[in-house]
Structures are given as structure tokens and as C-alpha cells.
């Protein structure tokens, strides 16, 4: 029977800069029941606080709700693991909410084959930003990527779309069914998960080259 091993805070994420969650990995438990607590203080302050919510983020997590989240302050946090034989502390982690945003995937992905009379046909891809993100404030710049592939192909083709919420692809294989997905990230954050795939059947009379 031993004191617990050193825990590690391995990830902090925010969906929208208004709330965030951090997760830790326990060290070895020393063969005894072990309690974990996360404590933090804001940079420039000495007063230590305990995690306000150990439930919302699931096991080994700490969730900071709106009233505990400030974009303009760096959080300095550590996890303490304690059993009957002693304690151990994780390394301190510095967290700036601005840099840990991982949004939800974009919404309303729509894919359409356009066949103008006077020009080559193309695939029109359109989407909306995730609802939790408020782009009007100017605090957020969301960037997008699209990926697509024929249904039976092994490799995806990925395109960086910048801030556009629409994208045009001209050359596609006629008669094939394509999968299309989109994801987003803030300029200083992490890519969201890919949106659910949208399928589109390319007509067999689609002009291949442009």
C-alpha cells in the first residue's frame, strides 16, 4: 500500500469561451481508495478555490460554469490525489480560455449539384456556424474545413475554406455517391469534430473536367 501516483491534467476545452472543462488522468492508486480535488487561482491572485463542479464533465473532470469563467484571466490549477498513505500533486497547469476553445461542429450542412446552362456544373456546399458561438461580438473568427470523398474511396480530400460558409467543387466523378463533412475552429483554438456526413449522388452526365 502506497501513496497515490502523480495525477496529470491533460486537457481543458471550452465550447464557446463562456464555460470550460478540464480533465485529469489519475496516477496509480497505491492500492487504496483515492480522493481527487482540483484547486485553482487566477493569475495575480493568491486566494485558492476548489473546483466548482466535479459532475458535469464526467469522471476525473472539473467544469467551470459561466459565473466561474473569465476570458481575460489565466487560471493556474493543480489536482491533489489523496489516500490513507499520503498525497501527491499534479504539475500546475496554466489555462487561458481564449486558447482552449473547441466548438461544436457546424450545422445545416447542405450539398447540392448545380448545373448552370452557360457554365460547368459544380458541387455547392453550404453550412452554418454552431449555435453556441456568437460571431456577432467579434470575439470569434471561425475557420472551416471541408472534406469529401467518393463513398468507396479510402482517402478524404480536405479543403481549407477560411471564414467562408460555402464552398464550390468543380471536378467530380460522374455517377458516384460522395460523402461531405465540415468542421470549424476559432483562430486560436481546436478543430471541432466533423459534422455528420451528408451524401450526394453526382449525376452521370456531370462534366468531369472544368
Amino acid at each position: 500500500q502506497l501513496p497515490p501516483g502523480k495525477p496529470e491534467i491533460f486537457k481543458c476545452r471550452s465550447p464557446n469561451k463562456e464555460t470550460f472543462t478540464c480533465w485529469w488522468r489519475p496516477g496509480t492508486d497505491g492500492g487504496l481508495p483515492t480522493n481527487y480535488s482540483l484547486t485553482y487561482h487566477r493569475e495575480g491572485e493568491t486566494l485558492m478555490h476548489e473546483c466548482p463542479d466535479y459532475i458535469t464533465g464526467g469522471p476525473n473532470s472539473c467544469h467551470f460554469g459561466k459565473q466561474y469563467t473569465s476570458m481575460w484571466r489565466t487560471y493556474i490549477m493543480m489536482v491533489n490525489a489523496t489516500n490513507q498513505m499520503g498525497s501527491s500533486f499534479s504539475d500546475e497547469l496554466y489555462v487561458d480560455v481564449t486558447y482552449i476553445v473547441q466548438p461544436d461542429p457546424p450545422l445545416e450542412l447542405a450539398v447540392e449539384v448545380k448545373q448552370p446552362e452557360d457554365r460547368k456544373p459544380y458541387l455547392w456546399i453550404k453550412w452554418s456556424p454552431p449555435t453556441l458561438i456568437d460571431l456577432k461580438t467579434g470575439w470569434f473568427t471561425l475557420l472551416y474545413e471541408i472534406r469529401l470523398k467518393p463513398e468507396k474511396a479510402a482517402e478524404w480530400e480536405i479543403h481549407f475554406a477560411g471564414q467562408q460558409t460555402e464552398f464550390k467543387i468543380l471536378s467530380l466523378h460522374p455517377g458516384q455517391k460522395y460523402l461531405v463533412q465540415v468542421r470549424c475552429k476559432p483562430d486560436h483554438g481546436y478543430w471541432s469534430a466533423w459534422s455528420p456526413a451528408t451524401f450526394i449522388q453526382i449525376p452521370s452526365d456531370f462534366t468531369m473536367n472544368d
Epitope: 480536405i158 479543403h159 471564414q163 467562408q164 464552398f167 468543380l170 471536378s171
Partner: antibody, heavy 118, light 111 residues
């Protein structure tokens, strides 16, 4: 017929400024991304900057960030590159290129030479 | 440091098949971003040859083909002709640079 015509190149001293223009004709200018790419004498191609259709989104190579500004005027069918704090290593032929889907550069101008020397 | 690596030179005799490679990394080609190929004839502006890994640009002969696998892409030219003598560049977007990368270029000589 697609035509791209760069202008504004020339001889400039280190620390000086130049503004390059790329006048486009023969298609709808506003429907495309736009790029600047440069080529130092006897060297390979180096991407400099690009600008999205809506103008609000721009990207720059690290080597020019903070010194160069890309812009576009859709009403004049013209792309610009404002180059400040020029250095000897900015000496190159500067090409403008139209960006189609996947931002592939499907048409290029003939290039304009920028020489930075004291 | 993100780079796209190409052989500096390649050569072949008329009628031969020549392949030019372009090796990237997990932040560009291996990431899934598409590869474009450009041809630059002596004294002229570059011209788009192959786009999105394997699509031939309009007007490009079918002797030119492109492919991509993993972190590499390649350009193949079959039935080599003297007018193919040029510099060839690959290009791909790079996630870590948030910018376009060009390969160093390959000078193709037709012997």
C-alpha cells in the same frame, strides 16, 4: 479571355515601400480567391498571401507577416499588395494568381519585378 | 519546419516516362490537403497542370497525370516531349503554417 496584368514593381531601397496592383479582366473578379506568389531570381516559387472572396479573410507567409497587406477592390477588378519595410530578400518577381475551388491557382499574371537594393 | 521536398532535377529521353515526387508531412499532404502541380516553362509565368491530386487542368494533355498516397504525391509524364522541358512545382496547404507551401521545384531536362 482571362487576363491578369501586374504593375507597380521597380527599384526601392531597404526599408522602403511599394504597392503592387493586379488588374483582371475577362471574368467575374469577385467570384474568386486571389493570391500573390513570388520568385526570387533563379529560385523557386514562394507563396506570399491570399485573400478570400469576401475580403475579410487574409493569410500571409511568415516571412512577410506584419509588413505586407493584401487587399482587393471588386468594383475595380483589381488586387493589391502593399509592401512596407522592404528587405533585400524581398527581391523577386511577384505574380498574382486567381484562386478557383481548392484555391488552386488556375491563372497567373506575367509578373512584376521588385528589386530591393541600396 | 514544414516543407514539400522535390528532387532538384529529373531527366528522360523523348517518349520515355518520368515521375517527379513531392514528399510532405502530416501537416500538409498527409493531413489530407490536396496537391496541385504547376509547370513553369523557361522565362514564363507558372501554369496549373494538375489540381486536387489527380485532375488535369483544361487543355493539359493526358500524358500528364497526378497521384497521391499518404504524405507523398507524384507527377508522371509519359511519352516525354522536348516541350515538356520546364520546372515543375507541387503545392499544398499547410495546417501548421496556415499557408500554402510550394515544393522546391524539379528541373526536367529532355535529353
Amino acid at each position: 479571355e482571362v487576363q491578369l496584368l501586374e504593375s507597380g514593381g521597380g527599384l526601392v531601397q531597404p526599408g522602403g515601400s511599394l504597392r503592387l496592383s493586379c488588374a483582371a479582366s475577362g471574368f467575374t473578379f469577385s467570384s474568386y480567391w486571389w493570391h500573390w506568389v513570388r520568385q526570387a531570381p533563379g529560385k523557386g516559387l514562394e507563396w506570399v498571401s491570399d485573400i478570400a472572396r469576401a475580403s475579410s479573410y487574409t493569410n500571409y507567409a511568415d516571412s512577410v507577416k506584419g509588413r505586407f497587406t493584401i487587399s482587393r477592390d471588386n468594383s475595380k477588378n483589381t488586387l493589391y499588395l502593399q509592401m512596407n519595410s522592404l528587405r533585400a530578400e524581398d527581391t523577386a518577381v511577384y505574380y498574382c494568381a486567381r484562386g478557383l475551388d481548392a484555391r488552386r491557382m488556375d491563372y497567373w499574371g506575367q509578373g512584376t519585378l521588385v528589386t530591393v537594393t541600396s | 519546419q514544414s516543407v514539400l521536398t522535390q528532387p532538384p532535377s529529373a531527366s528522360g529521353t523523348p517518349g520515355q516516362r518520368v515521375t517527379i515526387s513531392c514528399t510532405g508531412s502530416s501537416s500538409n499532404i498527409g493531413y489530407g490537403y490536396v496537391v496541385h502541380w504547376y509547370q513553369q516553362l523557361p522565362g514564363t509565368a507558372p501554369k496549373l497542370l494538375i489540381y486536387r491530386n489527380n485532375w488535369r487542368q483544361s487543355g493539359v494533355p493526358d500524358r500528364f497525370s497526378g497521384s497521391k498516397s499518404g504524405t507523398s504525391a507524384s507527377l508522371a509524364i509519359s511519352g516525354l516531349r522536348s516541350e515538356d522541358e520546364a520546372d515543375y512545382y507541387c503545392a499544398a496547404w499547410d495546417d501548421s503554417l496556415n499557408g500554402w507551401l510550394f515544393g522546391g521545384g524539379t528541373k526536367l531536362t529532355v535529353l
